[in-house]
Amino acid sequence: LRPSRVHNSEENTMRALTLKDILNGTFSYKTFFPNWISGQEYLHQSADNNIVLYNIETGQSYTILSNRTMKSVNASNYGLSPDRQFVYLESDYSKLWRYSYTATYYIYDLSNGEFVRGNELPRPIQYLCWSPVGSKLAYVYQNNIYLKQRPGDPPFQITFNGRENKIFNGIPDWVYEEEMLATKYALWWSPNGKFLAYAEFNDTDIPVIAYSYYGDEQYPRTINIPYPKAGAKNPVVRIFIIDTTYPAYVGPQEVPVPAMIASSDYYFSWLTWVTDERVCLQWLKRVQNVSVLSICDFREDWQTWDCPKTQEHIEESRTGWAGGFFVSTPVFSYDAISYYKIFSDKDGYKHIHYIKDTVENAIQITSGKWEAINIFRVTQDSLFYSSNEFEEYPGRRNIYRISIGSYPPSKKCVTCHLRKERCQYYTASFSDYAKYYALVCYGPGIPISTLHDGRTDQEIKILEENKELENALKNIQLPKEEIKKLEVDEITLWYKMILPPQFDRSKKYPLLIQVYGGPCSQSVRSVFAVNWISYLASKEGMVIALVDGRGTAFQGDKLLYAVYRKLGVYEVEDQITAVRKFIEMGFIDEKRIAIWGWSYGGYVSSLALASGTGLFKCGIAVAPVSSWEYYASVYTERFMGLPTKDDNLEHYKNSTVMARAEYFRNVDYLLIHGTADDNVHFQNSAQIAKALVNAQVDFQAMWYSDQNHGLSGLSTNHLYTHMTHFLKQCFSLSD
């Protein structure tokens, strides 16, 4: 719960937030996600680093792995085998890209309290996981996949063609990791561990991005990453399945690609096991408005996988791209052929549909002018999902249960009235068979995690309520937050406004717009945060606003697909429109308005500054995209098509920041980028800087040597300190 406001005499004891508070993470919160190991048991790492097993039904707990064992190998993570015999301990974590990292793995035998000796795992390993049943191990080492029947056994090598930056087996290449799978792995065990499916990515023909990593040596290193930019050659993907019981018998079998997909460039988008002998693959055309879901069956006689055309389901968008950010994945029901899936209904809202035979005959399960966001779990009698239906606030998330065992199916909101003021944005984590579940509430009040009975929805206990945070905030003057909407030309613009603690409508305040604005994003959410903008409002007396304009998510396809093939136009227009509306509210000093954003937000903030409206005095772009020709194919082409003459080259060319260099003359611009940004390459800011210099336009810039897209560590402190000075100078605020 947010601390209640204190008035008059007591107000003197309260202090504003400081930048130091933010940089030290003084007011960060904790969440509790149980590591479920059965219907009624979960593991959790205690404050003193013991791994503890909790049994919900007995209310009892005991340590299964001591902190001493963890410390003996400097373990930072662990994983219990499903047969409960072994634990892998992960150490020497070394980050690669957003999800990927390498690590050293040790196997600990819980039965005898000793590490498994003999046939130890090689190091460093790129990915490792237990089979879903028993204690088989699959792992990826040097881009090849290996299998162990038991942890102490010698490994069986499944693939042999793995090669750094060329062939990736069981792990994605850069673009699949970042823009398609959003995981560090590309292998999937069948439910009982009989089969192992994996992807092979061939990056041989992909152009390479190369940048300097300065380090401490006399000569900088060059980092080379196969990275397909818009219109470039893409990875070639193949899916294989191997029988892990007799891996040498027939070897890996390739799963056929649907003919309508294979006829031109395509992507693999996800794999879902249905049973041990049925698998579901999703494919996507390079022009990402056609997706095919293909259900394949194992043929015992031929030892191959058969994907009949009758089990191909096509999803097509006529108004934009397929899906939201990604194409949704199916959740299969107990009959192992029908499934539940979220896609657009006839009114252009993303909803849950039940598909039994064909997509055309799909039964719509949810409907309304709101969107279903995620299907968490389907049991014999219930379907649990999240949506933003409640009270028509798109930036909320509540958990619902639909009874599918009865007709007509009844719907119940599990979370809507639990802690109504404190909690309006939830996610959930379910145990086996949804016997129990944890709810994690992210706000708008102080986050809280609770445990619930899966049959009655009754709260069993509080897992984490952030009491220390609540106490720490008692003497802090937090800003006020409002979430409201503007109606402009048949478009609804939701905004969040962060106001100084002693906000007075009759006074004038400087305004900072914080923007992201990327396709299928959402910035206006009912979540708790004490961050940099909280400080700017609390201590520096600024008003901060976040606006979800066209292109943003969870409000229907009309808003979402408005930016299709036209990035950089409506997102910017809607920020400008909102600023004009804020000025009309009467408390904004129109001579002191700024805009800032990071990544896509850096692109939008740059275009807004260069819009020639005269609205903005200054602005900041952190790691901005400056031309869509410089960004990744999978992401960019989803929204922009191809940069070819017969497709959308014209808009690629006229949506660049560089084309507007001249318009920066009348604003103060701060451009910031990390030199080792693997995602939005430094090239983007280098080209903006070059264009500004060529146009003889003055600007400020800061680079962060050897830092990636996240600008982490000490760079974070430097970054926010630097941006604070810039804004205070822009707004004529004393330091």
Epitope: S38, G39, Q40, E41, N50, L53, N55, E57, T58, Q60, Y62, T63, I64, L65, S66, T69, L80, R84, Q85, L110, S111, G113, K435
Partner: nanobody, 116 residues
């Protein structure tokens, strides 16, 4: 602290059967997951089978189809029915929580000897 008492071991010929029992007493109730473990001479202790509080069972590959784990919550006991016994099943058999706690307190165990 929980006390665990194993019984039912003995000498049996290959192909024969035995039924082991484990009685649990003390502060931790029988609803916790329980497992049977064994230690052969000169070897390390290993898991044989486990049973969760909801009755879900798990077996190591070498005993699948021959051994059956069951539980009687009313009597706080866990059983291991061992059929088609092999010489390599010879070991001291122990019961404990599944997985065992740290530090693990093991009972005396019960000796199973399978002769050829």
């Amino acid at each position: 602290q929980v006390q665990l008492q194993e019984s039912g071991g003995g000498l049996v010929q290959a192909g024969g059967s035995l039924r082991l029992s484990c009685a649990a007493s003390g502060t931790m109730s029988s609803i916790n997951a329980m497992g049977w473990y064994r230690q052969a001479p000169g070897k390390q202790r290993e898991l044989v089978a486990g049973i969760l509080s909801d009755g879900t069972t798990k077996y190591v590959e070498s005993v699948k189809g021959r051994f059956t784990i069951s539980r009687d919550n009313a009597k706080n006991t866990v059983h291991l029915q061992m059929n088609s016994l092999k010489v390599e099943d010879t070991a001291v058999y122990y019961c404990n929580f599944f997985p065992p706690p740290v530090p693990a307190s093991w009972g005396q165990g019960t000796q199973v000897t399978v002769s050829s």
